[in-house]
Interface confidence: low
């Protein structure tokens, strides 16, 4: 049959011991070179739905440190600087990919894992359930 | 320093042709089994800093589809439903890991890449610069 020319520089990943396995170069290419390094670093304090950042560390995971946002209040901060409980602070969550060392303590063997992280908080109008 | 004993079942990936290369099992383990699938799906509309979600697709990347948040307004929505320009809607950004196929057309070879994505928006008090 017709074959697509395989790039001659492709790694040989035919090892039968590693089904469902691909080769991954860990020399990370960062596409964010032109971004402001400060980014949203002070938004957690200036937001009407402020949050604290908690360090989640796991040496068997890459990246080993992930910062988790926890909303400071149930409500949102109003113009007077007080918490308004007619509004809700809620976490904005995102599923991210991480590499989990597998089998454990193997320096060169990982498995893809999806985890849900809270990135920050936003202020939303609550869903009010009216009782008949 | 203290060394963690290497698991005897570890793959041998000491091939000198593949510096910084590891084996990754693509059979994704999802740690989010107990999360509400709806999650923050309606926050983009209910937020005082609402956002739209734009589809970013790249067939040479995993995940191939990433949703990018774009804040709808410069200001935030007040209690009357109007845009208040004394406050600012800002994107909450996060660096995430993706897999990029490299070299091209190698079916089982990838490189880790960091990209910056906007996950949602939050309402912040603006930084006001007073002119003397």
């Amino acid at each position: 049959g017709i074959t697509i020319p395989r790039n001659p520089g492709c790694p040989n990943s035919e090892d039968k011991n590693f089904p469902r396995t691909v080769m991954v170069n860990l020399n990370i290419h960062n596409r964010n070179t032109n971004t402001n390094p400060k980014r949203s670093s002070d938004y957690y304090n200036r937001s009407t739905s402020p949050w604290n950042l908690h360090r989640n560390e796991d040496p068997e995971r890459y990246p080993s440190v992930i910062w988790e946002a926890k909303c400071r209040h149930l409500g949102c901060i109003n113009a007077d600087g007080n918490v308004d409980y007619h509004m809700n602070s809620v976490p904005i969550q995102q599923e991210i990919l991480v590499l989990r060392r597998e089998p454990p303590h193997c320096p060169n063997s990982f498995r893809l894992e999806k985890i849900l992280v809270s990135v920050g908080c936003t202020c939303v109008t609550p869903i009010v359930h009216h009782v008949a | 320093g203290i060394t963690i004993p290497r698991n005897p079942g570890c793959p041998n990936s000491e091939d000198k042709n593949f510096p910084r290369t590891v084996m990754v099992n693509l059979n994704i383990h999802n740690r989010n089994t107990n999360t509400n699938p709806k999650r923050s799906s309606d926050y983009y509309n209910r937020s005082t800093s609402p956002w739209n979600l734009h589809r970013n697709e790249d067939p040479e990347r995993y995940p191939s589809v990433i949703w990018e948040a774009k804040c709808r307004h410069l200001g935030c929505i007040n209690a009357d439903g109007n845009v208040d320009y004394h406050m600012n809607s800002v994107p909450i950004q996060q660096e995430i890991l993706v897999l990029r196929r490299e070299p091209p057309h190698c079916p089982n070879s990838f490189r880790l890449e960091k990209i910056l994505v906007s996950v949602g928006c939050t309402c912040v008090t603006p930084i006001v610069h007073h002119v003397a």
Epitope: I4, E14, R20, T21 | N27, I28, S64, P107, N108
Partner: nanobody, 120 residues
Framework: QVQLQQSGGGSVQTGGSLTLTCAAS????????LGWFRQSPGKEREFVAA???????DYADSVKGRFFISRDNTMNTVYLQMNSLKPEDTGIYTC??????????????WGQGTMVTVSS
């Protein structure tokens, strides 16, 4: 050499059945999602079905309930069982392999294609 060798196909009457087979060689079979695309006369190539290495299966809406994809990792083979065939199923069916196929409906490795003709 990476190769996907197809067999099956041919002509059939409306309502008939056919099975397509695709045998892979030269790649880590289990590390790839495998699937089928088709190109009908005068149309773009379109996704038909795929099965991932996690055994997740996706079908195009137009073939759901009629076509069934399966894979045999011991034989490095993927199959497409096509039932209740319609004239609009006519086209060249091509096998595809790719680690990302299931998520992006695109592939880097293709078979040679095989013709399926459904007459009314």
């Amino acid at each position: 050499q990476v190769q996907l060798q197809q067999s099956g196909g041919g002509s059939v009457q409306t309502g008939g059945s056919l099975t397509l087979t695709c045998a892979a060689s030269g790649l880590t079979f289990e590390a790839n999602s495998l699937g089928w695309f088709r190109q009908s006369p005068g149309k773009e190539r379109e996704f038909v079905a795929a099965v991932s290495f996690t055994k997740r299966i996706d079908y195009a809406d137009s073939v759901k309930g009629r076509f069934f994809i399966s894979r045999d990792n011991t034989m490095n083979t993927v199959y497409l069982q096509m039932n209740s065939l319609k004239p609009e199923d006519t086209g060249i069916y091509t096998c595809a392999a790719d680690p990302l196929l299931i998520s992006n409906k695109r592939a880097n490795i293709w078979g040679q294609g095989t013709m399926v003709t459904v007459s009314s």
